[in-house]
Structure formats: C-alpha cells, structure tokens
C-alpha cells in the first residue's frame, strides 16, 4: 500500500518542514527561509508571521511552526493568536476612543484591560454592603440586615486555643 500511495501521490511522503516542489519534479524540498509547513504533504510553505511594531516575538518561526507574537509592555493581546494589541489602562479605568477614562461612580475595573462593570447590588441577594466599592474594587456583600439584629454577630468568633498535647475537656 505504501509503495502504491507513493507512486500515486509523490507529495504524500513530504514531512512537515518541507514542501512538494513542482520546480524539482515534485520531490520534497526544505521550506525556504522565513517560511514553514506544519503538516506533511504540503505543496507550498507558509510565510512566517513577523512580530513588528507593538507586537514582539514570543516564539520564533521554525521550519515546522509559525512565529507567535505577544504585545510590548503597556499593551495586551486581543483576538485569536494575538491578532491585535490593545493599550493597557490602569485599574479603575477603561479604554475608550479618547483613551483611558476613569470608571464612572458605581462601576469598577480590577484589571488593566476590559470595561468598567457595575458594582454588585447586594440587596438583590438580600444582603447588605459590608465594604463599599471603589473604581478598582467591587463592593463586598455581608450578611442580610436581619442577621445583624441585636445580639447577632456578623463575625464568627475564633475557636478557643488549645494547649498542645491536651484533649478537650
């Protein structure tokens, strides 16, 4: 079968990193400089991606795999395979068409990317606000107001410390 297949399609035995070269009677030639083929049986090699400008090289191109890019400091990747680089903002900001803008009151962003999101509405879960939100942090919801009736504690007391080597009385 192997011999039959070879005679039918001389390109089928070309390994990754080579191409089936029409200029050389369809024998397998190594991929030219700055190109690659990631699978066998290819009739051409693909041009390597070049990481230029705001992109930087994360992985060099080889004869069997494309280069991989990421973004220079101050930018982050967007899209499949880091097809775009987008400017970072500070925590508490979001990127708009006019640049980085502070989050509006009632919203926050705890990352250098993405948009400002509304604070959690604690009352929707029947809870109260334990820690107020900021531009950088969401609110922290605490127990429901009913749990905070006189005599009820919102914090569980720590277990009493035991001396080592003694069993509880």
């Amino acid at each position: 079968f192997e011999r039959t297949r070879s005679l039918q399609d001389p390109c089928s035995n070309c390994p990754a990193g080579t191409f089936c070269d029409n200029n050389r009677n369809q024998i397998c030639s190594p991929c030219p400089p700055n190109s690659f083929s990631s699978a066998g049986g290819q009739r051409t090699c693909d041009i390597c991606r070049q990481c230029k400008g705001v992109f930087r090289t994360r992985k060099e191109c080889s004869s069997t795999s494309n280069a991989e890019c990421d973004c220079t400091p101050g930018f982050h990747c967007l899209g499949a395979g880091c097809s775009m680089c987008e400017q970072d903002c500070k925590q508490g900001q979001e990127l708009t068409k006019k640049g980085c803008k502070d989050c509006c009151f009632g919203t926050f962003n705890d990352q250098k990317r993405g948009i400002c999101r509304p604070w959690t509405n604690c009352s929707l879960d029947g809870k109260s606000v334990l820690v107020n939100g900021t531009k950088e942090r969401d609110v922290v919801c605490g127990p429901s107001p009913a749990d905070l009736s006189p005599g009820a504690s919102s914090v569980t007391p720590p277990a009493p410390a035991r001396e080592p080597g003694h069993s509880p009385q």
Epitope: G17, D21, S29
Partner: nanobody, 121 residues
Framework: AVQLVESGGGLVQPGGSLRLSCAAS????????MVWYRQAPGKQRDFVAS???????IYADSVKGRFTISRDNAKNTTYLQMNSLKPEDTAVYHC???????????????WGQGTQVTVSS
C-alpha cells in the same frame, strides 16, 4: 558551481549502522540547505533529511529517531548517521545542495553521484 562527493555506503546487517559523508567544494558560501535523498530501484527519489545553514534539521517520518544529519563547517562536509538499519533502508543515497531562495525557486540545485546502501543478512 558546487561539487558534491558522497562516501560511506556499503553492505550492513539489519540493526547495524553506517555513516554517510557528503563533501562539498566550489561555491559553498551560497548553500542554504544540504539534503539527503534516497532512491530504491523502480521507486521515486525520497526525502530523508535536511540541514539548513542555520542548523535547522528535518527528517522523514520513516527515519526519525534512527538517522541523524549533521555538518562540519570546517570540513564543508554533511553527515548522515544511520542507526538501527532495516532492509527497507536499502537504496542509493544522494546528497543535494540547495542555493538561496529567489522567491519562487532555489537558485541552484546540485547533486552528488550517490552511494549505495544495502541492508541485508
């Protein structure tokens, strides 16, 4: 032009080893890749292994893990170390040099005369 002379072929038993050499002379400064091919009687010429001027190597699936291509720049020689040889490795082994890429094809393509490798008990 580039002249290529292969050596090191012969008769070897299955499981044995051979080292083929390909000595290059002439306009060797412009060589991009050195390639070993093999051709068994009545069959097409098959890619075995290649090494580029940058040292990148490629192997045919059928020889991966058994054959190693290397080069000695000082001697302008490319080697093919062949271990764990099998009867199906029997063929004439040809050395090939490829010049720089012009955007469509390799600028030149020179071949040695070949060296016979026979694997048989």
């Amino acid at each position: 032009a580039v002249q290529l002379v292969e050596s090191g072929g012969g008769l070897v038993q299955p499981g044995g080893s051979l080292r083929l050499s390909c000595a290059a002379s002439g306009s060797i400064f412009s060589i991009y890749a050195m390639v070993w091919y093999r051709q068994a009687p009545g069959k097409q010429r098959d890619f075995v292994a290649s090494i580029t001027s940058g040292g990148s190597t490629i192997y045919a699936d059928s020889v991966k893990g058994r054959f190693t291509i290397s080069r000695d720049n000082a001697k302008n020689t490319t080697y093919l170390q062949m271990n764990s040889l099998k009867p199906e490795d029997t063929a004439v082994y040809h050395c090939n040099s490829l010049g720089s890429w012009d955007g469509e094809r390799y600028e030149y393509d020179y071949w040695g005369q070949g060296t016979q490798v026979t694997v048989s008990s």
